[in-house]
Amino acid sequence: DVERTTCPPEKEVHEIDESLIFYKKRELEACVDAALLAAQMDRVDAIPFTYEQLDVLKHKLDELYPQGYPESVIRHLGHLFLKMSPEDIRKWNVTSLETLKALLKVSKGHEMSAQVATLIDRVVVGRGQLDKDTVDTLTAFCPGCLCSLSPERLSSVPPSVIGAVRPQDLDTCGPRQLDVLYPKARLAFQNMSGSEYFVKIRPFLGGAPTEDVKALSQQNVSMDLATFMKLRREAVLPLTVAEVQKLLGPHVEGLKVEEQHSPVRDWILKQRQDDLDTLGLGLQGGIPNGYLILDLSVREALS
């Protein structure tokens, strides 16, 4: 911790400027008034402070604002933002998208950090929901950041906002997040024609249930293998060989390449080998011909 000393009169600080870079850690702690620092935070980012000096400045602000910094300070944190822990950020109340933009710019190259994820979470809480302006800001300044939000936070996205989400914004989303976003996307795009609907819904399909995947197989969508591989395992397993063939169209040949990877591997294990053979791809591992399949889970449910 920084030792307390008294400030020499000639070192007294009346404004935040570049002369401070020559102050030792102890002098900075003793001579910089936290209230002055907070009032002139907009100057800090243009001054080449050392990492050690930034630690002192953070310490000063922490002492002045033990309950969390005001947004007027947060907006101008600059490099100091990257010294904040998620615990620090959780104390903040952030409602301005200008603040979010400023800190996302500082975090470029660090978009998936815990700091950024916590900041976005605070913005969503502060604004009450994940509205279109917030989504637009995230997609513009932080592609992929949408997926840093918890499923609970994503549930506050109105379906009307889904159209602003681009495929690359969903690249890092996990199954639980797509489970939340898919029904909203389905609702948002429900009035579109078949081909247009598929283009729009495709990035969200990692959250689609079996019945919706089956429905798509009837629409000649020619799903690409990358999208198929992102489908939920539970959604793929009940599909028949004929349904998968119709779903993938000309891309069905790609199953051979993905034969050892889930969900393809698990799906193959569920199919009859003679059905797989009809694809002519040499897929192996299906249920041998003549074997009877007993679904014990059904029997357990009945007993």
Partner: antibody, heavy 119, light 107 residues
């Protein structure tokens, strides 16, 4: 006086891993940021990665992102570069260098260690 | 990432000459630019930081200028010890990037 000494270089096959170290002395290691910079034979300097004084922030060049990991042990005054999935184009002299803050240049450099990726 | 472009890539000069090397950034980097000198088989050495500040111990014949996207390194009275390769580097973004280098050789 400030001294940075790299070690761990050598010949390695493509796809394999290597860990470089940089031993620091003559300054308060835990106060300063540390970088790795490399130079392929007969080529220019290429910045590889930086780690902040407390290890809280790390940044990488696109060419090594996902393959290389920069880390530090402040109790041992040592910087590391874990290099995985090595490629022929990673062949270079690797230098460690110090910076004192986000807006500071690289003021002290080690003498470098040669990494050769070849089958 | 910010791209740094140096020119010329090679420069032939004589002892006593005034030499100028240019460095251009793909976007504004304010004054956060450094110049380094490297001799064969040696580590780079910091000459200039913050576009125009001379690093301690560096001879005053070296000077730097510029801001935003255009920068220059000038050696006012080239000495035998100055024949080397010079690099610019931006440190405005956390992903620091170097120029491709300028080799100053004897004419």
């Amino acid at each position: 006086q400030v001294q940075l000494v790299e070690s761990g270089g050598g010949v390695v096959q493509p796809g394999r891993s290597l860990r470089l170290s940089c031993a620091a002395s003559g300054f308060t290691f835990s106060s300063d940021g540390m970088n790795w910079v490399r130079q392929a034979p007969g080529k220019g300097l290429e910045w590889v990665a930086v780690i902040w004084n407390d290890g809280s922030n790390k940044y990488y060049a696109d060419s090594v992102k996902g393959r290389f990991t920069i880390s530090r042990d402040n109790s041992k005054n040592t910087l590391y570069l874990q290099m995985n999935s090595l490629r022929a184009e990673d062949t270079a002299v690797y230098y460690c260098a110090r910076d004192r803050g986000p807006l500071w240049p690289l003021d002290y450099w080690g003498q470098g260690t040669l990494v050769t990726v070849s089958s | 990432d910010i791209q740094m472009t140096q020119s010329p890539s090679t420069l032939s000069a004589s002892v006593g000459d005034r030499v100028t090397i240019t460095c251009r950034a793909s976007q504004s980097i304010s004054r956060w630019l450094a110049w380094y000198q490297q001799k064969p088989g040696k580590a780079p050495k910091l000459l200039i930081y913050k576009a125009s500040s001379l690093e301690s111990g560096v001879p005053s014949r070296f000077s730097g200028s510029g801001s935003g996207t255009e920068f220059t390194l000038t050696i006012s009275n080239l000495q035998p010890d100055d024949f080397a390769t010079f690099y610019c580097q931006q440190y405005n973004s956390y992903s620091r990037t170097f120029g491709q280098g300028t080799k100053v050789e004897i004419k």
